[in-house]
């Protein structure tokens, strides 16, 4: 998260750290007791490694009573996700067992009504991704409030040049932005999960390259079918 600040500890009980061989790889969001939603590209480099999900965490390194690391029983990338595109960049991870819920671990309601979030709406994005242009990774969860950007602006030739389909949404990226390591994390508007940070290799913090988020409402049928 660029230009953000440290989050209030455990105030986002839906927040997950998707980990590879014990190290933070991507963000994720608890959407059901046994399911975490993340980004499909996050697993591209994970073929030989052990993928786990950390819930109830604020600090990645410090002991916390609510922290628990879960093994992954099943990883379900969206069937249409591809390495070279940002489209359909969703991944569902089934935990080895139902998460122990409490004040610091709680699923987040997700948007099912397939309607664009109004431009200018302030949404919260959180993650353990890099926090500056040097590439420093934080130990504690960071967050930032970002205004939603209308699709027409985001699709300008100077911005994302038509790449933003109706199944994607954008948020402003002028110095405040999601970045490397935040992929798969939640974009929350009005207490509801609206988007998932895409994991394309995008310049961060540049106003001309807005953040791109996968609209979960557009994938409601797929999410429901996997969770069923």
């Amino acid at each position: 998260i660029l230009g953000g600040r440290e989050a209030e500890a455990h105030a986002r009980p839906y927040m997950a750290s998707v980990q590879l061989n014990g190290a933070h790889l991507c963000g994720g969001v608890l959407v059901a007791e046994q399911w975490v939603l993340s980004a499909a590209h996050c697993l591209e480099d994970a073929a030989d490694g052990k993928v786990q999900v950390l819930l109830g965490a604020h600090s990645l390194s410090q002991p916390e009573p609510s922290k628990r690391l879960y093994d992954v029983l099943r990883a379900v990338p969206h069937p249409d996700s591809q390495p070279d595109t940002i489209d359909h960049d969703l991944l569902l991870l089934q935990l080895s067992e139902k998460a122990t819920l409490g004040p610091a671990v709680r699923p987040l309601p997700w948007q099912r009504v397939d309607r664009d979030v109004a431009p200018g709406t302030l949404c919260d994005v959180a993650g353990w991704g890099i926090v500056n242009h040097a590439g420093r990774r934080p130990d504690s969860l960071q967050h930032v409030l970002l205004p939603v950007l209308d699709r027409a602006t985001c699709n300008r030739a100077t911005h994302h040049d038509g790449a933003i389909t109706e199944r994607l949404m954008c948020a402003e990226s002028n110095r405040r932005d999601s970045c490397k390591g935040d992929s798969g994390g939640p974009l929350v508007c009005g207490g509801v999960l609206e988007g998932v940070v895409t994991s394309g290799s995008r310049v961060c913090g540049n106003a001309k390259k807005p953040g791109i988020y996968t609209r979960v409402a557009s994938y409601a049928a797929w999410i429901d079918s996997v969770l069923a």
């Epitope: 500056n132 590439g135 490397k180």
Partner: antibody
Framework: EVQLQQSGAELVKPGASVRLSCTAS????????MHWVSQRPERGLEWIGK????????KYDPKFQGKATITADTSSNTVYLQLSSLTSEDTAVYYC??????WGQGTSVTVSS | QSVLTQSPAIMSASPGEKVTMTCSAN?????MYWYQQRPGSSPRLLIY???NLASGVPVRFSGSGSGTSYSLTISRMEAEDAATYYC?????????FGGGTKLEIK
């Protein structure tokens, strides 16, 4: 544990080029930015530039533009610094860094005929 | 480009003494990093984002400042702190380092 292993010292002739390597272990270079910094006794520490290994995007200090080229090979978790048209002014120790936090041991480059 | 001037260039301190060195920028910068370099070694990150201690750095080190004026303080000098200290700014490209403060032990 994060480690950056740099290639060995180089003695090169004026006008030649040299390519230094830095192999990372303990993390995937695609998940951060990698930097190169030079150190000369009379000039101190100077930031040369950085690369985003995930997409190859680079940014340089203008004074090193044309002199330095930073590349990355994600399959071997290695970043490279190529220095061209070398002069005695380029004699220095060159460090690679992960996120400006973890430094390699440095590679000494001496330009001499 | 942002020019960073460190002062003093050389200083010495006795064990247990408090040490403060400064880094002045010719234009306002938002954050400062500090590095320690012992003779024959690579630099090591001490302080990031002006005042945050890097992993494994003793709590006797602290950083502060804003705008054009930043400082690094060692609350009680120890022999192993004899080194050269560099500041670095991240606000504007190109990122620049100060010329260093060499700290010797008395």
């Amino acid at each position: 544990e994060v480690q950056l292993q740099q290639s060995g010292a180089e003695l090169v002739k004026p006008g030649a080029s040299v390519r230094l390597s830095c192999t990372a272990s303990g993390f995937n270079i695609k998940h951060t930015y990698m930097h190169w910094v030079s150190q000369r006794p009379e000039r101190g520490l100077e930031w040369i530039g950085k690369i985003d290994p995930a997409n190859g995007n680079t940014k340089y200090d203008p004074k090193f533009q044309g002199k330095a080229t930073i590349t990355a090979d994600t399959s071997s978790n290695t970043v490279y610094l190529q220095l061209s048209s070398l002069t005695s002014e380029d004699t220095a120790v060159y460090y690679c860094l992960n996120a400006m936090e973890y430094w390699g041991q440095g590679t000494s480059v001496t330009v001499s005929s | 480009q942002s020019v960073l001037t460190q002062s003093p260039a050389i200083m010495s301190a006795s064990p247990g003494e408090k040490v403060t060195m400064t880094c002045s920028a010719n234009s306002s910068v938002s954050d400062m990093y500090w590095y320690q370099q012992r003779p024959g070694s690579s630099p090591r990150l001490l302080i990031y984002d002006t005042s945050n201690l890097a992993s494994g750095v003793p709590v006797r080190f602290s950083g502060s400042g804003s705008g054009t004026s930043y400082s690094l303080t060692i609350s009680r000098m120890e022999a192993e702190d004899a080194a050269t200290y560099y500041c670095q700014q991240w606000s504007t490209y190109p990122w620049t380092f100060g010329g260093g403060t060499k700290l010797e032990i008395k």
